[in-house]
């Protein structure tokens, strides 16, 4: 632990102003694991005037940073960029004559606070203004800066020509595209300072370029995936003050396709798993030894988990027995075509007959094949249907 | 049970149209293509085309693509396919078929007599 | 469109005996989501056609389990393990993996 300092398994506080810091402190080697400090605490650095780019990319799970009453004047740019945890930043009473919000951007700060230092009127900290309208808390910082006449004047006043948040304007055509196809999305950005513009696509699967100038880009995606379905396309318009960003969401539409089809497994109820893919929303259809299975409160449907084009579920049955032996296929369609699954069910063993043995269709109980499924003039034969798992109700009619 | 029933026996004159319907029961009307097949007098079984009764997207055999037209009203789950500028050689029975790429379900056909 | 072709036209058989009727597709009629969309049908006279086998070898609800359905690809077979006098009647293979869909045609007769 460096002099003037204390360390434990997650903190480092230096606050002993003698013989004090000249540079952020760094661990030893063989000590504690940096990735492991969560604070740094420093206070009464007079000579710590820097932090340079390197200082702090090895703490990268620290959350609160504090340099109070200290000498700090330059925060590289590059300082935080691995420390994505940061959350609380303290600054108070330093020698910081300007701060520029890249050091800050990729961060989800909820606190930073700069009071007490000697800012410098100027666009460059036009941002600090602008990130304390928008919180308008009560706990507003009383920041100052000083002006061309060496005059302290409140940063809530600050009025300085041609220097505002820029603005980002995406033309987008309708973002539902139909997988495969390409689009192109087309944005302008407008601002004083003149901002820069660049596309935030996320992870997105599909292949993509963009052309940029400083205030027009377009961004074409080609051969579009069905797994980019629901994500945000961003055109963001970024300056000194602060960025601006329009959004929009991908809808990409496509073919189902039944990716998990198992056999029943038995649970509170019995369950034939499944999870297809597909949107629009797929319409799901079961048969049952090749007829319409038409569902019932006995045998459903149900849709456990929907994660956005996904769909998890079951063919619930309740109580089947060995009438529900059979094979059950499962298509699903939407208007872009449709996919098709099946599996044989093995509920339990004929009565009386050896569970091993057992016939795995329950074609035995049709007999008279003269009155079967699709002879359809007859309305008494029910031969086509699934037989109910209501123990109540031997026919194959649910209601 | 699913049932498929079409409508009855009809006589046309050649050049004249016939609309043949197929009520759907048992099932969701709406959840399952119907397909139309004919089968002329002594020959084998020919596919027309199919319908989309959610949507009521069509698709039609290259043969009787501009002469067909299938429809549906799913308010009375049924199914219609009218057949335009007939001929002798139009004189079969018409089934209306479901529900998937087997066809599981027939109507029990409808006799359509082309004849001066 | 793709053609099927039946053989044999004319099946004499044996009431109690096995038959079996061979179906040929011009091409193959394995779908792009990985079935197979071939079903045979059995047409009675005066009736209208009737579902046996599906998807190649699943029988279809009800049906007696004297009829089987087998082949691949190209080629596919139905067998009656023991005709029945009830078994009499026009037999169909018909594909329903490409559009148009199409049928062949045979005859089953009973001796």
């Known amino acids: 632990c460096p002099t003037s300092c204390k360390c434990s398994a997650s903190r480092i506080w230096c606050s002993d102003p003698s013989p004090g810091i000249v540079a952020f402190p760094r661990l030893e080697p063989n000590s504690v694991d940096p990735e492991n400090i969560t604070e740094i605490f420093i206070a009464n650095q007079k000579r710590l005037e820097i932090i340079n780019e390197d200082d702090v990319e090895a703490y990268v799970g620290l959350r609160n940073l504090t340099i109070v009453d200290s000498g700090l004047k330059f925060v590289a740019h590059k300082a935080f960029l691995k420390n994505s945890n940061l959350q609380h930043i303290n600054f108070t009473r330093n020698k910081l004559t300007s701060l520029s919000r890249k050091h800050f951007r990729h961060l989800d700060l909820s606190e930073l606070i700069l009071v007490g230092n000697p800012f410098t009127c100027s666009c460059d900290i036009m941002w600090i203004k602008t990130l304390q309208e928008a919180k308008s808390s009560p706990d507003t910082q009383d920041l100052y800066c000083l002006n061309e006449s060496s005059k302290n004047i409140p940063l809530a006043n600050l009025q300085i020509p041609n220097c505002g948040l820029p603005s980002a304007n995406l033309a987008a055509p309708n973002l539902t595209v139909e997988e495969g196809k390409s689009i192109t999305l087309s944005c302008s950005v407008a601002g004083d300072p003149v901002p820069n513009m660049y596309w935030d696509v996320g992870n997105l699967v599909s292949k993509h370029m963009n052309e940029t100038s400083h205030t027009q880009g377009s961004l074409r995606i080609t051969n579009i995936s069905s797994d980019d379905s629901g994500k945000q396309i961003s055109c963001v318009a970024e300056n000194l003050v602060g960025e601006d960003q329009d959004s929009v969401n991908l809808t990409v539409h496509f073919a189902p396709t039944i990716t998990f089809l198992e056999s029943p497994t038995s649970d509170h109820h019995w369950c034939i798993p499944f999870t297809v893919k597909g949107n629009p929303k797929p319409a799901l259809q079961w048969f049952y030894n090749g007829a319409i299975l038409n569902e019932s409160k006995y045998i459903c449907t149900k849709i456990h988990v929907t994660n956005h084009t996904e769909y998890h579920g079951c063919l619930q049955l309740d109580n089947p027995t060995h009438m529900n032996n059979g094979d059950y296929t499962l298509i699903a369609k939407n208007e872009y075509g449709k996919d098709e699954k099946q599996i044989s069910a093995h509920f339990m063993g004929w009565p009386g007959i050896d569970d091993g043995a057992n016939p795995n269709y329950p074609d035995v109980i049709y007999e008279d094949y003269g009155t079967a499924a699709n002879d359809i003039g007859d309305t008494t034969n029910r031969s086509n249907e699934i037989p109910s798992t209501d123990v109540t109700d031997k026919t194959g009619r649910e209601h | 049970q699913v049932q498929l029933v079409q409508s009855g026996a009809e006589v046309k004159k050649p050049g004249a149209s016939v609309k043949v319907s197929c009520k759907a029961s048992?099932?969701?009307?709406?959840?399952?293509?119907m397909h139309w097949v004919r089968q002329a007098p002594g020959q084998g079984l020919e596919w027309m085309g199919w319908i989309d009764p959610n949507s009521g997207g069509t698709r039609y055999a290259q043969k009787f693509q501009g002469r067909v037209t299938m429809t549906r009203d799913t308010s009375i789950s049924t199914a219609y396919m009218e057949l335009s500028r007939l001929t002798s050689d139009d004189t079969a029975v018409y089934y209306c078929?479901?529900?998937?790429?087997?066809?599981?379900?027939w109507g029990q056909g409808t006799l359509v007599t082309v004849s001066s | 469109d793709v053609v099927m072709t039946q053989s044999p036209l004319s099946l004499p058989v044996t009431l109690g005996q096995p038959a079996s009727i061979s179906c040929r597709s011009s091409q193959s009629l394995v779908h792009s989501n990985g079935n197979t969309y071939l079903s045979w049908l059995q047409q009675r006279p005066g009736q209208p056609p009737r579902l046996l086998i599906y998807k190649i070898s699943n029988r279809f609800s009800g049906v007696p389990d004297r009829f089987s359905g087998s082949g691949a690809g190209t080629d596919f077979t139905l067998k009656i393990s023991r005709v029945e006098a009830e078994d009499v009647g026009v037999y169909y293979c018909m594909q329903g993996t490409h559009e148009p869909y199409t049928f062949g045609q045979g005859k089953l007769e009973i001796k």
């Open positions: 048992g099932y969701t009307f709406t959840a399952y293509d």
């Open positions: 078929a479901g529900v998937t790429s087997w066809f599981a379900y």
